[in-house]
C-alpha cells in the first residue's frame, strides 16, 4: 500500500502504527521527538520498501537500531531533500547502529548523521555503495570509531561474511551491525540490482528484486511504476507523479494538495502531473489542467483588504513578494532600515501594476525608487484627495525617481505631487511626467521648484574617461580635469565601483540612505597640477571579472534659483584580465579494474577565465604496508571508554597530546597553530553546521493544531 | 477509453448466493477504489462499501457487514461483489463505481460507473 | 448514518426556466482539515448515474455551466439556471465525508 503525503510521526512512539501497511512512502517520514524510552522491539514494518522523498529521524529516545523498525528499506529516493539530503540522523541519543541492511540505494541527495553520541558502525558502510556522491555526505559528533570496537560478522572468529572495499585508502569488511553484512551486487551486474542469490536484476530495478531479471520482480524501479511493471520512461496517456510512477489523466485531476483550492488542483505539465505550473509557466484559464509559457514574469494578483498597504519595514514588504498586480493603495514610508534598496527589490521588485495610487512620504532612507524596477502602470482608480494618484513628499535623501533611459511608466489617471525632497532635481520630475503622460495635468503647486532639489547638484555636466589600463586585479583609469566656473569650488572627486556581471547597473542600484551602498566609494584628491589628468588605481580587485565604475565630481558652485552645479561620468563596464584558476574541486578517484582508474572532480569555484582544458597528473605510489600490519584482534589496549557527548569541536585524546613534531626538533612539542585557511574553514563549518540546525529546528517545531 | 464492464443478469432463490463482477479497463486498476452501490427498483441509490485493490482493505456499509464480501483480481483488473443470504429485498442492480485512490487530499467522486446488473431474487 | 434529505421529491420545470434542488443532512459533513465531500449525481431515464458537481461548488469536466452547487456545512442546493430537455432524470446529492456514504432520496425533475 502506498502511503503519504508524508508522514509525521512525533510525541508518541504509537503513532508507529500508521506505518503499518506501507510499501511504499510517497513523501517523506519524520521520526522525531519521543522523548520518553520505549520499547520498540514489538514495532516492526517488514513491508516498507521504499521512501520516495527522505528519511528524517530526531531526538528519538529508547531507539537503538533502525534494522528492527525497517528490515527492507531499500531505497530512498530523494524526490525531495531536507536541506539536500536524504537521510538525516541527528541527536538520536540512545542509536547504537543504523542497520539498515537492505538499504541499497539513495537516488538523490546525500546523507547527514550528527550528534548521536551512542552511534558506531559508521566506518564499516561503503556510502558510495548507496549514493553516486559521497562527497557531500556529513558525518560528524558520532561515537568515535577508536571507541566503538566495530566488529563485521565473523571477524572474531576469523571466518569474516562480509565483503570488502576500500574507503579513504582502508581496505576493510563492510557491515551494518555485528550481525548484518552490507550486500553488494557481483560486479558481473555492473549498476544493476541484484537478488539475495546474487543473480542480477532487470535494468529497470532499483535496489533489489525477488526474481532475476524480471521487470515485475522488482522492489523499487529505478525511473518509473505503471501497473505492477517498472518502465524507463511512463507510457501513453500517463504521467510523472512524485517521481517515481505513472498516473493517468483522471487520476492527476482528482488530487489536490495540501493548501490547494478545487479549482487549483494538480496540473500537468511535460509530461509530469505535479501540484503547480513550474517556475514561468501558468495555468491555461482558472479550471485548467495544462500550462503555457507566461510573457513575462508570471502574473500574481495580490489584495490589500484595508484597500492600502503601508510599507513602513521589509516585513511589510515581504507581504508583496512575487505580486506583479497590486489592487489598492501603495503609501511607502520608510524612515530606515538595513539594506533597505536590495530587499525592497527583492519583495516589490515584481510589481507591474498599482491599481490605486502610490504616496511615498517620510521615506528618508530611500535615495531612488528604482526597488520598484518592474512599475509600469499605476492606473489611479482610487486616487488622494485633490486627484493625486502618484504623491511624493518629504523625503529628506530621495535622489533619482527610476532610471527614465529604461523606464516605461504610465500613470493612467490622476495628478503628480512633489513637495521637500530637498535632494530630487526638478529635472527629474519633469522628465517623469513626459514619460508617464502627465504633462499638462499638473497645475502650478504640485511640483515645487523651490523646495524639491535645493540641496542638489541638479545641473550635471558630463566627466569623461581618458584611458583604461587593466591587469589580472588592477585598473587604471583616468579622466578629464573639470573645470568648473570658478576653479576653487571642484574639491575632489569620487570614484564608484562594483562587480557588474551584465551591463545593466544603475547609480541608485542597492543605494538607500542608511548607508547601504552595492558600490565601493574611493576619494580622488585634485592633482596638485591643473594641466594633470586626475585618475586612480584600483587594486585588489577579481581576475576575470566585469566592473562598472563611475565618477563624480565634488563640487561648491551654485546656480541659478541656489542650485549646485556638479559633473559626473557615464557608467564604464571594464572587464580584468584572466588569472591561473583556483584548484578543481571534489578530486575523486576510483579503481574499475586492475588497470584502470576512474578519475573525477568538480570545476575550480574560480575559474578567473574561460577554462579550456584540464591537466591530470598521475603517479605510481609504493602500496601502505599498514594495511597489511593491522590486525584488529591483537591490536593495542582499546582507550577507556568515555561516553561521547555529542559534539564535534575536539576529537578525544587519552594520550599526552604533545607529540607532534614541529620543525626539525623531535621530541615532545606542542600542536602547530592552524593557519588562516584551517581557522576559516572551521568558522565557515561551524557556520555551516548553526543554519542546518536552525533549518532542522524552524522545520519540525510547529504550533500545535488548534 | 475508462470502462467498467459488469457481469450479466442474475436470479437467484432466496437463502442463496450471488458474485457480481466488474472488469476494468483503460486504467490502471490499483490506483482506484472499487465502489458497489445498488439501486433496487424505483428506489433511490445505496452505498454498500468498497475495496482497496492494492492490499483487499475494504470499508463496507454496517447493513451490509455480515453477508458481503468484496474481493479483487488484480491480474484480470477485475472487482468482485458477493452478497449472501439473499432476500426478496435485495432485488436491485448492483452499479460498481471507481473512486480515487489517495491517501492525501482529493476530490473524491464517483467519476466512472459500468452498466449495472440486474440481480433478482424470488421463489 | 447520516441521513441526507432532498426536496422537492418532484420538481416540474418549464424549459427556459431556473430549477433548485435542495438537500440537507442530518449532520454536518464538513471534515476536520475544513473538505465537504458533496456530490450531485443526475440519474437519466436507463442509465447509470452521471456526476455533475463535486465538493459542493465544483463543476465536473464537460458538464454545462446552467448547473451549479453551493452551500455549507448541513445545507446544499443545485440550481440549474435554463433548465433543457436532455436535464430530465432524478437527481441525487450524496455525501463522501462520514463512512456509510449515503445518498438522497432523489428528486425527479420533468419538463411541464
Known amino acids: 500500500e502506498i502511503c503519504g503525503p508524508g508522514i509525521d510521526i512525533r510525541n508518541d512512539y504509537q503513532q508507529l502504527k500508521r506505518l503499518e501497511n506501507c510499501t511504499v512512502i510517497e513523501g517523506y517520514l519524520h521520526i522525531l521527538l519521543i522523548s520518553k524510552a520505549e520499547d520498540y522491539r514489538s514495532y516492526r514494518f517488514p513491508k516498507l520498501t521504499v521512501i520516495t522523498e527522505y528519511l528524517l529521524l530526531f531526538r528519538v529516545a529508547g531507539l537503538e537500531s533502525l534494522g528492527d523498525l525497517f528490515p527492507n528499506l531499500t531505497v530512498i529516493r530523494g524526490w525531495k531533500l531536507f536541506y539536500n539530503y536524504a537521510l538525516v540522523i541527528f541527536e538520536m541519543t540512545n542509536l547504537k547502529d543504523i542497520g539498515l541492511y537492505n538499504l541499497r540505494n539513495i537516488t538523490r541527495g546525500a546523507i547527514r548523521i550528527e550528534k548521536n553520541a551512542d552511534l558506531c558502525y559508521l566506518s564499516t558502510v561503503d556510502w558510495s555503495l548507496i549514493l553516486d556522491a559521497v562527497s557531500n555526505n556529513y558525518i560528524v559528533g558520532n561515537k568515535p570509531p577508536k571507541e566503538c570496537g566495530d566488529l563485521c560478522p565473523g571477524t572474531m572468529e576469523e571466518k569474516p561474511m562480509c565483503e570488502k572495499t576500500t574507503i579513504n585508502n582502508e581496505y576493510n569488511y563492510r557491515c551494518w551491525t555485528t550481525n548484518r553484512c552490507q550486500k553488494m551486487c557481483p560486479s558481473t551486474c555492473g549498476k544493476r540490482a541484484c537478488t539475495e542469490n546474487n543473480e542480477c536484476c532487470h535494468p529497470e530495478c532499483l535496489g533489489s528484486c525477488s526474481a532475476p531479471d524480471n521487470d515485475t520482480a522488482c522492489v523499487a524501479c529505478r525511473h518509473y511504476y505503471y501497473a505492477g511493471v517498472c518502465v524507463p520512461a511512463c507510457p501513453p496517456n500517463t504521467y510523472r507523479f512524485e517521481g517515481w510512477r505513472c498516473v493517468d489523466r483522471d487520476f492527476c485531476a482528482n488530487i489536490l494538495s495540501a493548501e490547494s483550492s478545487d479549482s487549483e488542483g494538480f496540473v500537468i505539465h511535460d509530461g509530469e502531473c505535479m501540484q503547480e505550473c513550474p517556475s514561468g509557466f501558468i495555468r491555461n484559464g482558472s479550471q485548467s489542467m495544462y500550462c503555457i509559457p507566461c510573457e513575462g514574469p508570471c502574473p500574481k494578483v495580490c489584495e490589500e483588504e484595508k484597500k492600502t498597504k503601508t510599507i513602513d519595514s521589509v516585513t511589510s514588504a515581504q507581504m508583496l513578494q512575487g505580486c506583479t498586480i497590486f489592487k489598492g493603495n501603495l503609501l511607502i514610508n520608510i524612515r530606515r532600515g538595513n539594506n533597505i534598496a536590495s530587499e525592497l527589490e527583492n519583495f516589490m521588485g515584481l510589481i507591474e501594476v498599482v491599481t490605486g495610487y502610490v504616496k511615498i512620504r517620510h521615506s528618508h532612507a530611500l535615495v531612488s525608487l528604482s526597488f520598484l524596477k518592474n512599475l509600469r502602470l499605476i492606473l489611479g482608480e482610487e486616487q488622494l484627495e485633490g486627484n493625486y494618484s502618484f504623491y511624493v513628499l518629504d523625503n529628506q535623501n530621495l535622489q533619482q525617481l527610476w532610471d527614465w533611459d529604461h523606464r516605461n511608466l504610465t500613470i493612467k489617471a490622476g495628478k503628480m505631487y512633489f513637495a521637500f525632497n530637498p535632494k530630487l532635481c526638478v529635472s527629474e520630475i519633469y522628465r517623469m511626467e513626459e514619460v508617464t503622460g502627465t504633462k499638462g495635468r499638473q497645475s502650478k503647486g504640485d511640483i515645487n521648484t523651490r523646495n524639491n532639489g535645493e540641496r542638489a547638484s541638479c545641473e550635471s555636466d558630463v566627466l569623461h574617461f581618458t584611458s583604461t589600463t587593466t591587469s589580472k586585479n588592477r585598473i587604471i583609469i583616468t579622466w578629464h580635469r573639470y573645470r568648473p566656473p570658478d576653479y576653487r569650488d571642484l574639491i575632489s572627486f569620487t570614484v564608484y565601483y562594483k562587480e557588474a556581471p551584465f551591463k545593466n547597473v544603475t547609480e541608485y542600484d542597492g543605494q538607500d540612505a542608511c548607508g547601504s551602498n552595492s558600490w565601493n566609494m574611493v576619494d580622488v584628491d585634485l592633482p596638485p597640477n591643473k594641466d594633470v589628468e586626475p585618475g586612480i588605481l584600483l587594486h585588489g580587485l577579481k581576475p576575470w571579472t566585469q566592473y562598472a565604475v563611475y565618477v563624480k565630481a565634488v563640487t561648491l558652485t551654485m546656480v541659478e534659483n541656489d542650485h549646485i552645479r556638479g559633473a559626473k561620468s557615464e557608467i564604464l563596464y571594464i572587464r580584468t584580465n584572466a588569472s591561473v584558476p583556483s584548484i578543481p574541486l571534489d578530486v575523486l578517484s576510483a579503481s574499475n579494474s586492475s588497470s584502470q582508474l576512474i578519475v573525477k572532480w568538480n570545476p575550480p569555484s574560480l575559474p578567473n577565465g574561460n577554462l579550456s582544458y584540464y591537466i591530470v597528473r598521475w603517479q605510481r605510489q609504493p602500496q601502505d604496508g599498514y594495511l597489511y600490519r593491522h590486525n584488529y584482534c591483537s591490536k593495542d589496549k582499546i582507550p577507556i571508554r568515555k561516553y561521547a557527548d555529542g559534539t564535534i569541536d575536539i576529537e578525544e585524546v587519552t594520550e599526552n597530546p604533545k607529540t607532534e613534531v614541529c620543525g626539525g626538533e623531535k621530541g615532545p612539542c606542542c600542536a602547530c597553530p592552524k593557519t588562516e585557511a584551517e581557522k576559516q574553514a572551521e568558522k565557515e563549518e561551524a557556520e555551516y553546521r548553526k543554519v542546518f540546525e536552525n533549518f532542522l529546528h524552524n522545520s519540525i517545531f510547529v504550533p500545535r493544531p488548534e | 477509453q475508462v470502462q467498467l464492464v459488469q457481469s450479466g443478469a442474475e436470479v437467484k432463490k432466496p437463502g442463496a448466493s450471488v458474485k457480481v463482477s466488474c472488469k476494468a479497463s483503460?486504467?490502471?486498476?490499483?490506483?482506484?477504489?472499487m465502489n458497489w452501490v445498488r439501486q433496487a427498483p424505483g428506489q433511490g441509490l445505496e452505498w454498500m462499501g468498497n475495496?482497496?485493490?492494492?492490499?483487499?482493505?475494504?470499508n463496507y456499509n454496517q447493513k451490509f457487514k455480515d453477508r458481503v464480501t468484496m474481493t479483487t483480481d488484480t491480474s484480470t483488473s477485475t472487482a468482485y461483489m458477493e452478497l449472501r443470504s439473499l432476500r426478496s429485498d435485495d432485488t436491485a442492480v448492483y452499479y460498481c463505481?471507481?473512486?480515487?485512490?489517495?491517501?492525501?487530499?482529493?476530490?473524491?467522486?464517483?467519476?466512472?460507473w459500468g452498466r449495472g446488473t440486474l440481480v433478482t431474487v424470488s421463489s | 448514518d447520516i441521513v441526507m434529505t432532498q426536496s422537492p421529491l418532484s420538481l416540474p420545470v418549464t424549459p427556459g426556466e431556473p430549477a433548485s434542488i435542495s438537500c440537507r443532512s442530518s449532520?454536518?459533513?464538513?471534515?476536520?482539515?475544513?473538505?465537504?465531500?458533496l456530490e450531485w449525481y443526475l440519474q437519466k431515464p436507463g442509465q447509470s448515474p452521471q456526476l455533475l458537481i463535486y465538493r459542493v461548488s465544483n463543476r465536473f469536466s464537460g458538464v454545462p455551466d446552467r448547473f451549479s452547487g453551493s452551500g455549507s456545512g448541513t445545507d446544499f442546493t443545485l440550481k440549474i439556471s435554463r433548465v433543457e430537455a436532455e436535464d430530465v432524470g432524478v437527481y441525487y446529492c450524496f455525501q463522501g465525508s462520514h463512512v456509510p456514504y449515503t445518498f438522497g432520496q432523489g428528486t425527479k425533475l420533468e419538463i411541464k
Open positions: 475495496i482497496n485493490p492494492n492490499n483487499g482493505g475494504t
Open positions: 463505481a471507481r473512486w480515487i485512490l489517495y491517501y492525501g487530499r482529493s476530490k473524491w467522486y464517483f467519476d466512472v
Open positions: 483503460g486504467y490502471a486498476f490499483t490506483d482506484y477504489y
Open positions: 449532520q454536518s459533513i464538513v471534515q476536520s482539515n475544513g473538505d465537504t465531500y
